[in-house]
Interface confidence: medium
């Protein structure tokens, strides 16, 4: 979370950044809240980038301004216009590219004066896990997969029985580089797996942290899986 | 009303380096581009780069590259364009400008003479 | 880069008679999203900075006279000046802000006859 305070000259008001992290090809959020205004023709959202010498979006006198939008962002950009009146400058950016990756600012100008605050936004890609039994294996395996990540992440095997164990040995993870040349598919496989137990596999870079588990009884398979963005330091 | 007030005309020997200010007034200068245009005697408008204050981000035209460089400094709303290794066609009047809807206020000018 | 090619080099008018200037740029200036070609015309008169005139192809800048007025779309764009009068005497500059580099046409320079 950052906090920033207006600049000298007339008064300043409170702007609020939070760091995040955009998955490649999907949309993002870059979130930016501010002290309202009860007049909606009074405000002005800019964000910029560092790096960037255009503006990559401009809000004001109640609709996007994209005359001095930079290239890089033309076409790409939104906010959410009907929330701008109570104090909502989150950018919505489409179809994130690698290169989005670096420092904005979000700048505000009201009635009650100026503010502004920096946020960090990192890009990578990140996806789901699913841990599936391997029957076409000779051995009872499990095979872990998820379709995109970058950069290239870590692959750990837990499990529940043997608490604390190391599977490097008994697991073969492999990167299979996506068609688009930057994401790579994610597979591992775990041997020697044993019945009523219930594995892990964990995946992780430096933007998010995804894990996916299997249990396998007799009778029946459970999954379940679940993602978790590493975006909350503050700075 | 914006101005833009740049400072005064330069001589300058060969393979030295020259530095003009521009100082804004009037309108908020962190978030406006400004950027520089130099026009040789008789020739005509050349772009050289822009900043954009509130970043320092900035972008240079080709031919310039590693010879210029651009700042500003926004506790004095002034930019500066500094040019390096100068020779006999960097004699020229030195432009700044604020880019908004094409560029629509302009320096009065700097003219550096470059002769030894 | 874009590059913008400007015709006549120079043109003489006749007070009170009309004046037309062509620029061509090597590629569209057009942005499809706003609908806006991102091209500017600006005067240039002798010991003076250049003057905004028009901006998006064809909105008139702040103070300038109606009699000028700007046309054209994509990668052909004019001036026009209705009914040259005798302040009008300078050169006249394109000059598209599409993309980086920003890029000038090499001016037009207009007389009276």
């Known amino acids: 979370l950052i906090i920033g305070f207006g600049i000298s000259g007339r008064h300043s008001i409170t702007v609020t950044t939070v760091a995040s992290a955009g998955n490649i090809g999907e949309d993002g959020i870059l979130s930016c809240t501010f002290e309202p205004d009860i007049k909606l023709s009074d405000i002005v959202i800019q964000w910029l980038k560092e790096g960037v010498l255009g503006l990559v979006h401009e809000f004001k006198e109640g609709k996007d301004e994209l005359s001095e939008q930079d290239e890089m962002f033309r076409g790409r950009t939104a906010v959410f216009a009907d929330q701008v009146i109570v104090g909502n400058a989150s950018l919505r950016l489409k179809n994130v590219q690698l290169t989005d990756a670096g420092t904005y600012k979000c700048y505000i100008i009201t009635s009650k004066g100026k503010g502004n605050a920096n946020l960090e936004y990192k890009t990578g890609a990140f996806s789901m896990p699913e841990v599936n039994v391997d029957y076409n294996a000779s051995s009872e395996t499990l095979r872990c997969e998820a379709p995109r990540w970058f950069p290239q992440p870590t692959v750990v095997w837990a499990s529940q029985v043997d608490q604390g164990a190391n599977f490097s040995e008994v697991s073969n993870t492999s990167f299979e580089l996506n068609s688009e040349n930057v994401t790579m598919k994610v597979v591992s496989v775990l041997y020697n797996v044993t019945i009523n137990n219930t594995y892990s596999c964990m995946i992780e870079n430096d933007i998010a942290k995804a894990t996916g588990d299997i249990k396998v009884t007799e009778s029946e398979i459970k999954r379940r899986s679940h993602l978790q963005l590493l975006n909350s330091k503050a700075s | 009303q914006v101005q833009l007030v740049q400072s005064g005309a330069e001589v300058k020997k060969p393979g030295s380096s020259v530095k003009v200010s521009c100082k804004a007034s009037?309108?908020?200068?962190?978030?406006?581009?400004i950027h520089w245009v130099r026009q040789a005697p008789g020739q005509g408008l050349e772009w050289m780069g822009g900043i954009m204050p509130i970043f320092g981000t900035t972008k240079y035209a080709q031919n310039f590259q590693g010879r210029v460089t651009i700042t500003a400094d926004e506790s004095t709303s002034t930019a500066y364009m500094e040019l390096s290794s100068l020779r006999s066609e960097d004699t020229a009047v030195y432009y700044c400008?604020?880019?908004?809807?094409?560029?629509?206020?302009w320096g009065q000018g700097t003219t550096v003479t470059v002769s030894s | 880069d874009i590059v913008m090619t400007q015709s006549p080099d120079s043109l003489a008018v006749s007070l009170g008679e009309r004046a037309t200037i062509n620029c061509k740029s090597s590629q569209s200036l057009l942005y499809r999203p706003v609908n806006k070609n991102f091209l500017a015309w600006y005067q240039q008169k002798p010991g003076q900075p250049p003057k905004l005139l028009i901006y998006w192809a064809s909105t008139r800048g702040s103070g300038v006279p109606d009699r000028f007025s700007g046309s054209g779309s994509g990668t052909d764009f004019t001036l026009t000046i209705s009914s040259l009068q005798a302040e009008d005497v300078a050169t006249y500059f394109c000059?598209?802000?599409?993309?980086?580099?920003?890029?000038f046409g090499q001016g037009t320079k207009v007389e009276i006859k």
């Open positions: 009037g309108d908020t200068f962190t978030t406006y581009q």
């Open positions: 400008a604020r880019r908004n809807y094409g560029m629509d206020v």
């Open positions: 000059q598209q802000y599409y993309s980086t580099p920003i890029t």
